[in-house]
């Protein structure tokens, strides 16, 4: 698994470097997670032909994966820093159950899957420090998450492969949209 942000050799070799600002740390953290997703997608795509499926075909699924919409205030039209930040944190919290599902779904990239999960937890903490209106953030219900996890794990092999692919692609898209918005804050 790659080394977490702030612990790579370049950082060690340059102790005089200015410490990262909160925004830079968040930016680096998201890019680190995106690298992890990229590695996981490689394994998934090598293992099945899901990656060749059209977006339209994949859209026909029952997963309720978080997605950015116009009303979330993260796009240029209607951009709203506070609303957007709440959406990013809420979305990441909702993704956690799906990241838990990804554990044990990878053979050669098991560590990588764990790194993506743990790095996301750290990212949520960074973002919660940045948010002013923490009351607006709804945390998913643990019981609901537990039953969702059980349901996903009970699927047949083909559906599990499809689910894995969809989670990775949706999570990547959510992080990209989040970072685009965060870079405007």
């Amino acid at each position: 698994a790659p080394v977490p942000p702030g612990e790579d050799s370049k950082d060690v070799a340059a102790p005089h470097r200015q410490p990262l600002t909160s925004s830079e740390r968040i930016d680096k953290q998201i890019r680190y997670i995106l690298d992890g997703i990229s590695a996981l997608r490689k394994e998934t795509c090598n293992k099945s032909n899901m990656c060749e499926s059209s977006k339209e075909a994949l859209a026909e699924n029952n997963l309720n994966l978080p997605k950015m919409a116009e009303k979330d205030g993260c796009f240029q039209s209607g951009f709203n820093e506070e609303t957007c930040l709440v959406k990013i944190i809420t979305g990441l919290l909702e993704f956690e159950v799906y990241l838990e599902y990804l554990q044990n779904r990878f053979e050669s990239s098991e560590e990588q899957a764990r790194a993506v999960q743990m790095s996301t937890k750290v990212l949520i903490q960074f973002l919660q420090k940045k948010a002013k209106n923490l009351d607006a953030i709804t945390t998913p219900d643990p019981t609901t998450n537990a039953s969702l996890l059980t349901k996903l794990q009970a699927q047949n092999q083909w559906l599990q492969d499809m689910t894995t692919h969809l989670i990775l692609r949706s999570f990547k898209e959510f992080l990209q949209s989040s970072l685009r918005a965060l870079r405007q804050m």
Epitope: I30, L34, Q76, Q176, R183, Q184
Partner: nanobody, 124 residues
Framework: EVQLVESGGGLVQPGGSLKLSCTTS????????VGWFRQAPGKEREFVAD????????WYAESVLGRFTISRDDAKNTVYLEMNGLKPEDTAVYYC?????????????????WGQGTQVTVSS
């Protein structure tokens, strides 16, 4: 890194239009975010517009909002910048840049590959 080539620049009268293209032969260009920047003589390079890996996610500088449109055709490995209602102050060398993370943004540091630029001159 990907090799980027801009084209479509030229001389145009105020109020006129141009469509710039940014092309690469690199695979997986569809996964890159692409930004357009411009640099007028004696001025700093400035952000114009960008498009994420998801084509619906675009962002524009205030000065071009409503006049310029950024779009992508992943089948052709090309990103376009359609410029309407051109003004003399739009005169500059226009550069496209790519971000392998598919994110982009309004700062040069977010991009890891750059083209050589194409000249746009708006004059009567």
């Amino acid at each position: 890194e990907v090799q980027l080539v801009e084209s479509g620049g030229g001389l145009v009268q105020p109020g006129g239009s141009l469509k710039l293209s940014c092309t690469t032969s690199g695979r997986r260009f569809s996964e890159y975010a692409v930004g357009w920047f411009r640099q007028a003589p004696g001025k700093e390079r400035e952000f114009v517009a960008d498009i994420g890996e998801q084509a619906e996610n675009t962002w524009y500088a205030e000065s071009v909002l409503g006049r310029f449109t950024i779009s992508r055709d992943d089948a052709k490995n090309t990103v376009y910048l359609e410029m309407n209602g051109l003004k003399p102050e739009d005169t500059a060398v226009y550069y496209c840049a790519a971000d392998k993370y598919g994110v982009g943004g309004n700062a040069q540091g977010y991009y890891d590959s750059w083209g050589q630029g194409t000249q746009v001159t708006v004059s009567s």
